[in-house]
Amino acid sequence: PLATIPVSTTSLTSSEGSTISTPSVDISTPVTTSIVGDQCSRCKNGGFWDGLKCQCLTPYYGESCEEVVNSIDIAPPETVSAQMELTVTVTSVKFTDELKNHSSQEFREFNKTFTEQMNIVYSGIPEYVGVNITNLRLGSVVVEHDVLLRTKYTPEYKTALDNATEVVKQKITKVTTEQIMTNDNCSALMCFNTTGTQVQNITVTQYDPVEECRQKAEEYEDYFLVEYRDQKPYCISPCESGFNASKNCNHGKCQMSQNGARCLCVTTETHWYSGEDCNQGTQKSHHHHHH
């Protein structure tokens, strides 16, 4: 089949000196392009033909998936979390076998009181979400549990969660030192054995926007970078305007290649432009240089 695509051409010269013609839509000069055989061959860089158009893979776009996008969507999670595996020993309750059964009346009651006690302990920590008992065992009651922390994603989320885990350690150490049995009795909601408090493990959500950006940029990974705007990360190439790393091509168009971003300088009716940033203009008639 024959496709008629009306275009006019603007001459662009790359900063290396070669001239490239890029199409811009115009009704004045009709050009016919013959598309023969398998449509899949039209789609470059791993793109595929869906019957109507090329479906391109990141980071490509264009009619034949031949162009590289200026920015790639990266989506950090709304919230990030940490899980602390802790063990405390509760002395104000005597262990019974029923506590091993998570559906028993005894476990449910213990869970309610323990949760209430921990909510009091951690009440001043904004990242605190709650506790989850994983196991109860003899001794009086050794409580293996997770402390769950959550915060909104910001570039500094790791620091925020690290600080919160430190406060958790301080608070649980304090309460298990202060709320202890006196004369075989507890006057608090729960009492603890000071020596039974241990932090076993801390797991923090791992999200690295730079890593996601590099992965999605594929062979262009060295040329895409992350910049922040309003605490949100953006994965951009230097061809994306409005960022610190943006390349200014002046009288030209920024284009990504496998060697990085380069400027394709325009040639107008009166001037041609050259230089790495297309900032050197030469007047065609007078051959006069000006900057």
Epitope: T91, S92, V93, K94, T96, E98, S104, Q105, E106, E109, F110, K112, T113, M181, D184, N185, C186, S187, A188, L189, M190, C191
Partner: nanobody, 124 residues
């Protein structure tokens, strides 16, 4: 859920005796804790005594030691408080409380189940 029904309060002269009862229902096990607390007008609720129904533990507040006896009848699921040598300062509303755990705490907040109060007045 656990239900508690307290009874046996009344007016008694100093030096007299009273026996409080608290019937429990809704337990899935025969091993749990029960307690008596009291609250005098304008004061905080305080523990009087507690017992483990398996006989493993009893506790008495210093102010009632030697005068009050806590006991539990497993066949009737009933808690008792035998109060002898009553004094004016024993005047209060007496509450029975329970837990499905074997508790060793005198803090009322640790006890999840409560009966309604029964009034004990010691007055001449």
């Amino acid at each position: 859920d656990v239900q508690l029904q307290a009874s046996g309060g009344g007016v008694v002269q100093p030096g007299g005796s009273l026996r409080l009862s608290c019937a429990a229902s809704g337990y899935t096990s025969n091993r749990y804790s029960m307690a008596w607390f009291r609250q005098a007008p304008g004061k905080e609720r305080e523990v009087v005594a507690f017992i483990w129904t398996d006989g493993g533990r009893t506790y008495y507040a210093d102010s009632v030691k030697g005068r009050f006896t806590i006991s539990h009848d497993n066949s009737k699921n009933t808690l008792y408080l035998q109060m002898n040598s009553l004094r004016a300062e024993d005047t209060a509303v007496y509450y029975c409380a329970a837990s499905s755990l074997l508790l060793q705490t005198i803090n009322p907040r640790a006890w999840p189940y409560w009966g309604q109060g029964t009034m004990v007045t010691v007055s001449s």
